[in-house]
């Protein structure tokens, strides 16, 4: 687990379910019980016991990660799907997004790659074997986020309420912000964009920027290089 | 077609308690977000609580003029929200209303409320 | 907490004439593209029912009459042509951050 880890309100990702005790402190505009507490605005806050964060696809976990069952490598299989650990070099593999960055799916193992732009949710071709047991649906998460009475025919536009980023329109994302995820726009050249130095850090975010647009990467401004590691900027830029 | 139902209001003591329910049905209960809004007589809307669903954890949300005295909760067997309301003061006198996120990040559909009066 | 502003109190008007409500916010409500700007009427003894989200884009339902402008702090709502059942009391509401406000309404009254 992580301990303390710092969050930027203004950063992004998701925030993971916590457990355990309620928050809360003298002053704070509200209150994200259990364990969390926010202001808003650029202040910063402590959260402890990261826990796993449920996620509907890659996208939605740090760069370090992949979405999954916990029982199972595949993502896309009925039951709870979390963000996982990256497989390193020669670790066996589905699809590109389990490999850790620099490293890509290549008949079911991950191996070292120049180019790190390969989709991330790209099937890797030629794989027979379950990389782990089946996992049984029927654990609350769902599958799809429709209402019972209605039938979408249209992709969601920025502020619409998503589950996945394939329920939103082109050029957005599923992104969190706060208690709801909404459809957000991708990010283009030049924009902030959050780099998960940290290992599991990006569930502790609970305003999430969409990733990079095509042909960009999210790498730290040039500019910026002299300044301390913890206030380091980065922005989306051609690869 | 989406309908929530609030009861459980009424009136209560200052330092009293209540716990108010919101009956949900027409869509997918537990994957989303819900909250509770109330309004004074006479005034304007104020945030209570919520609490968001299944993909973010069912996290619980509140304002600190309600934090420690009020706690929002939800039984997705049941396609209910609750909350219970402890210490209640003359200034929680209110219609509170339960609100949820279907397709909009806003509150786009709401219940037709419950009155809670707190009084001596 | 991000305080709205809304202008005027009360707003007289026929029907058919148009209705310009405005929500000044005492900071930025726009991030990530969004302005978090919602706009909902409410009518007497009812709950209210949102026209507009994300500062502009019209709420399922919501006839074409009412649109939503502006960004960063200052919204408006129109009505382009007020209808009988057009006359309530309007209010809008942030939800850029936590906790999330509304503004003190505009009530519409028919002159």
């Known amino acids: 687990t992580l301990n303390s880890v710092l969050i930027n309100s203004n950063a992004i990702k998701n925030l993971p379910p916590p457990l355990g005790g309620a928050g809360g402190q003298p002053g704070s505009a509200v209150s994200v019980a259990p364990g969390v507490l926010y202001e808003g605005g650029n202040k910063y806050q402590t959260l402890d016991n990261y826990q796993p964060y449920p996620c509907a696809e890659d996208e939605e976990c740090g760069t370090d990660e992949y979405c999954s069952s916990p029982s199972r490598g595949a993502a896309g299989v009925g039951g709870v799907q979390i963000c996982l650990a990256c497989r390193k070099r020669r670790k066996r593999c589905m699809r590109h997004a389990m490999c850790c960055p620099g490293n890509y799916c290549k008949n079911g193992i991950c191996m070292p790659s120049d180019h790190s732009h390969l989709p991330r949710g790209e099937i890797e071709e030629g794989i027979i074997e379950n990389l782990g047991n089946d996992h049984g649906a029927g654990d609350g998460y769902p599958r799809r986020t429709t209402l019972t009475s209605k039938i979408y025919h249209t992709k969601g536009q920025e502020g619409s309420v998503c589950l996945r980023s394939s329920d939103c329109a082109t050029g957005l994302c599923c992104a969190r912000h706060f208690w709801s995820k909404i459809c957000k726009p991708v990010l283009k050249e030049g924009q902030v964009c959050t780099k998960h130095r940290r290992k599991g850090s990006h569930g502790l975010e609970i305003f999430q920027r969409c990733y990079c647009g095509e042909g960009l990467a999210c790498r730290i401004q040039k500019d910026h290089h002299q300044t301390s590691n913890s206030s380091r900027l980065h922005t989306c830029q051609r690869h | 077609e989406v309908q929530l139902v609030e009861s459980g209001g009424g009136l209560v003591q200052p330092g009293g308690s209540l716990r108010l329910s919101c009956a949900a049905s027409g869509f997918t209960f537990s994957s989303y977000a819900i909250s509770w809004v109330r309004q004074a007589p006479g005034k304007g809307l104020e945030w209570v609580a919520s609490v968001s669903g299944t993909g973010l954890g069912f996290q619980t949300y509140y304002p600190d003029s309600v934090k420690g005295r009020f706690t929002i909760s939800r039984d997705n067997a049941k396609n209910s929200l609750y909350l219970q309301m402890n210490s209640l003061r003359a200034e929680d006198t209110a219609v509170y209303y339960c609100a949820t996120s279907l397709e909009n990040y806003a509150f786009d559909y709401w219940g037709q409320g419950t009155t809670v009066t707190v009084s001596s | 907490e991000i305080v709205l502003t809304q202008s005027p109190a009360t707003l007289s008007l026929s029907p058919g004439e148009r209705a310009t409500l405005s929500c000044r916010a005492s900071?930025?409500?726009?991030?990530?593209?969004?302005?978090?700007i919602n706009w909902y009427q409410q009518k007497p003894g009812q709950a209210p029912r949102l026209l507009i989200y994300?500062?502009?884009k019209q709420g399922s339902g919501i006839p074409a009459r009412f649109s939503g402008s502006g960004s960063g702090t200052d919204f408006t709502l129109t009505i382009s042509s007020l209808e009988p059942e057009d006359f309530a009391v309007y209010y809008c509401q942030q939800l850029k951050e936590v906790p999330p406000t509304f503004g003190g309404g505009t009530k519409v009254e028919i002159k």
């Open positions: 994300a500062g502009s």
């Open positions: 900071e930025s409500v726009d991030d990530f593209g969004i302005s978090f």
